[in-house]
């Protein structure tokens, strides 16, 4: 049984205390109320690009 904070969840997933397992962050788009969604970061910003005049 995983203890939260010891072994991180795979990329794109987050620990659910309600389910005691890592859950896919993609499901948070359909159901944002899930407890593990708090640990899912937003999509990374687009690469920074300098705009020269």
């Amino acid at each position: 049984e995983r203890v939260p904070g010891t072994t991180p969840c795979p990329r794109g997933s987050s620990w659910s205390a309600d389910l005691d397992k890592c859950m896919d962050c993609a499901s948070c788009r359909a159901r944002p109320h899930s407890d593990f969604c708090l640990g899912c970061t937003a999509a990374p910003p687009a690469p920074f690009r300098l705009l020269w005049p």
Epitope: D18, A30, H33
Partner: antibody, heavy 120, light 108 residues
Framework: EVQLLESGGGLVQPGGSLRLSCAAS????????MIWVRQAPGKGLEWVSY????????HYADSVKGRFTISRDNSKNTLYLQMNSLRAEDTAVYYC?????????????WGQGTLVTVSS | DIQMTQSPSSLSASVGDRVTITCRAS??????LNWYQQKPGKAPKLLIY???SLQSGVPSRFSGSGSGTDFTLTISSLQPEDFATYYC??????????FGQGTKVEIK
């Protein structure tokens, strides 16, 4: 065969306490989330409480928060509901139910229920 | 809280009839809707999960449809053992779930 068997119901006076048990058999109990649902006489179903597979996370309906405590003993394959400060409106049949194996989207097995009557 | 409203509250039908029960959510719940059957003095029994998936062992005359706020349970040809009360349940806000008030299917 999956079975859930509730016990511990009975007649109790307002302000009293009861502890309900739900004995699970026929499946590996520890990976499953569990809930308690109640049904007042002649009424519909009301969710009461939820517990995660390890027992580390619990949730309650506002109507019972602070009075009821859900717990589980995975070594005994048993779910519990400690009910304190009971009120007349807690009178109901109490059911335990097993959550789905991938999420808690649905509840696929239910016990037969145990009747709790709160009356003086 | 999400409220679930079923209609009708009760209905009378005959064996062989096609029966439709509706369930409306107070806000969108996507497809996170389940249906249960309950007979007097018995525990609820899962029929349909995630709006349209038939639970193992449930006869194919039961079907579910819908998404968002409006859902339907259909019994294509009512059988004597189908006279019972049916409940919808939303799991969009799991583990904080809510049930509809129930629809009683009686013999005409």
């Amino acid at each position: 065969e999956v079975q859930l068997l509730e016990s511990g119901g009975g007649l109790v006076q307002p302000g009293g306490s009861l502890r309900l048990s739900c004995a699970a058999s026929g499946f590996t109990f520890s990976p499953y989330p569990m809930i308690w649902v109640r049904q007042a006489p002649g009424k519909g179903l009301e969710w009461v409480s939820y517990i995660s597979p390890s027992g580390g996370s619990t949730h309650y309906a506002d109507s019972v928060k602070g009075r009821f405590t859900i717990s589980r003993d995975n070594s005994k394959n048993t779910l519990y509901l400690q009910m304190n400060s009971l009120r007349a409106e807690d009178t109901a049949v109490y059911y335990c139910a097993r959550g789905g194996d991938t999420y808690f989207d649905y509840f696929d097995y239910w016990g037969q229920g145990t009747l709790v009557t709160v009356s003086s | 809280d999400i409220q679930m409203t079923q209609s009708p509250s009760s209905l009378s039908a005959s064996v062989g009839d096609r029966v439709t029960i509706t369930c409306r959510a107070s806000q969108s719940i996507s497809g996170y809707l389940n249906w249960y059957q309950q007979k007097p003095g018995k525990a609820p029994k899962l029929l349909i999960y995630q709006a349209s998936s038939l639970q193992s062992g449930v006869p194919s005359r039961f079907s579910g449809s819908g998404s968002g706020t409006d859902f339907t349970l259909t019994i294509s040809s009512l059988q004597p053992e189908d006279f019972a009360t049916y409940y919808c349940q939303q799991s969009y806000t799991s583990p904080f779930i809510t049930f509809g008030q129930g629809t009683k299917v009686e013999i005409k």
